[in-house]
Interface confidence: medium
């Protein structure tokens, strides 16, 4: 079936920075993160406080994979691990957790990217857009349905 | 039949329990767009309060409206115009 | 946790009146629609109208306008249905529903069942 | 009213099979590219459960199973796979106008 226009909530391919304190390289790995539409509307009525919550697109179901830093100094482990979404839900964002906010200026990939994560066969997946503007459905790529 | 993964457009509606015949109430609502993704280390390095995931939102709202009195003399927003823009109420 | 808690059931006499009474609690009472829906042996569901708590405009189906009022108490946070004039007909299980996104009845109180009978 | 007429009446399917509920409306319950078409489950002596609302949007907490579609008149629910839980009555409710109106409902069965 075609592409959505719209596509809900899902998980996508994202190639995201993976870097640790103390590690002088950074490297880019595919993974899925969760992106895409939820519903939402605007209260009419007056005088009324809170408004009707606000759904927004979240992790639902997380696996987490480890990778292997090169070059980190003695003492520091190297190991480090990042989260892989399994599936996504329209929810509530979760302030213990999460950084809930608006469209974000900071880069999800390596600024300088030293080493290329190998580990997939699969050709990387196209780079999240920059985030300084939400992506529209054309931006989005999505996981096959 | 559409695909069922598509989401509506954020759009005006009009509501069926405020509206009154020639006296339409619209609503904005639909679908917008928002991700959520690992929080980097960059990122985590400037927070008070260490999080692990950034969630990046819109919100379907009204971007005008005029305030009306309907029947049974009370208010509310008649919405003319909608976007998907910062959302207020999607914490808990 | 949303939750809307029903009155028990009634028995009542033709031609009496009822008031069924659904309580809320779990998010603000005065934000939300609180609608009424009517089902009749266990199959068809007939919505009566809805109240809007914050400042109590209702709206009916034309069959049940001279049949149910709708009310609320908002210190209680709750609200009420009275059913006049009761015949067999009005014999059934009655709902309170609260409104949610997109005017979806999204939390149900569990039921309250009127049985008319001399 | 908008009348909607739901069919079967009564419906058996095996477990793990795909059920397939439908509904149509006397008149397009769509405006503005919504489809203001819902569907419920109800439970003996329960009250009815939302699953689906604009036709196509899985209601909070309801599993993946379940999926709407549809626009204008003609409306369909899915189940897939069918689970020994999925023993209910289904309804479709249009909200588009009021009087909000509901189809006859659905029996859905195991076979």
């Known amino acids: 079936s075609k592409e959505p226009l719209r596509p809900r909530c899902r998980p996508i391919n994202a190639t995201l920075a993976v870097e640790k304190e103390g590690c002088p390289v950074c490297i880019t790995v595919n993974t899925t993160i969760c992106a895409g539409y939820c519903p939402t509307m605007t209260r009419v009525l007056q005088g009324v406080l809170p408004a009707l919550p606000q759904v927004v697109c979240n992790y639902r179901d997380v696996r987490f994979e480890s990778i292997r830093l090169p070059g980190c100094p003695r003492g520091v482990n190297p190991v480090v691990s990042y989260a892989v979404a399994l599936s996504c839900q329209c929810a509530l964002c979760r302030r213990s957790t999460t950084d809930c906010g608006g469209p974000k200026d900071h880069p999800l990939t390596c600024d300088d990217p030293r080493f290329q994560d190998s580990s997939s066969s699969k050709a990387p997946p196209p780079s999240l857009p920059s985030p300084s503007r939400l992506p529209g459905p054309s931006d989005t790529p999505i996981l096959p349905q | 039949a559409p695909d069922v993964q598509d989401c509506p457009e954020c759009t005006l509606q009009e509501n069926p329990f405020f509206s009154q015949p020639g006296a339409p109430i619209l609503q904005c609502m639909g679908c917008c767009f928002s991700r959520a993704y690992p929080t980097p280390l960059r990122s985590k390095k400037t927070m008070l309060v260490q999080k692990n995931v950034t969630s990046e939102s819109t919100c379907c709202v009204a971007k005008s409206y005029n305030r009306v009195t309907v029947m049974g003399g009370f208010k509310v927003e008649n919405h003319t115009a909608c976007h998907c823009s910062t959302c207020y109420y999607h914490k808990s | 946790e949303v939750q809307l808690q029903q009155s028990g059931p009634e028995l009542v006499k033709p031609g009496a009146s009822v008031k069924i009474s659904c309580k809320a609690s779990g998010y603000t009472f005065t934000d939300y629609n609180m609608h009424w829906v009517k089902q009749s042996h266990g199959r068809s569901l007939e919505w009566i109208g809805y109240?809007?708590?914050?400042?109590?405009?209702?709206g009916y189906n034309q069959r049940f306008n001279s049949k149910a009022t709708l009310t609320v108490d908002n210190s209680s946070s709750t609200a009420f249905m009275e059913v006049r004039s009761l015949t067999s007909e009005d014999s059934a299980v009655y709902y309170c529903a609260r409104e949610g996104i997109f005017y979806t009845m999204d939390y149900w109180g569990q039921g309250t069942s009127v049985t008319v009978s001399s | 009213d908008i009348v909607l007429t739901q069919s079967p009446a009564s419906l058996a399917v095996s477990l793990g099979q795909r059920a397939t509920v439908s509904c149509r409306a006397s008149e397009s319950v769509d405006n503005n590219g919504i489809s203001f078409m819902n569907w419920f489950q109800q439970k003996p002596g329960q009250p009815p459960k939302l699953l689906i609302y604009?036709?196509?949007i899985q209601g909070s907490g309801v599993p993946a199973r379940f999926s709407g579609s549809g626009s204008g008149t003609d409306f369909s629910l899915n189940i897939h796979p069918m689970e020994e839980d999925d023993t209910a009555m289904y309804f479709c409710?249009?909200?588009?106008?009021?009087?909000?109106?509901f189809g006859g409902g659905t029996k859905l069965e195991i076979k």
């Open positions: 604009a036709a196509s």
């Open positions: 409710q249009q909200i588009k106008e009021v009087p909000p109106t």
């Open positions: 109240i809007y708590p914050y400042s109590g405009p209702t």
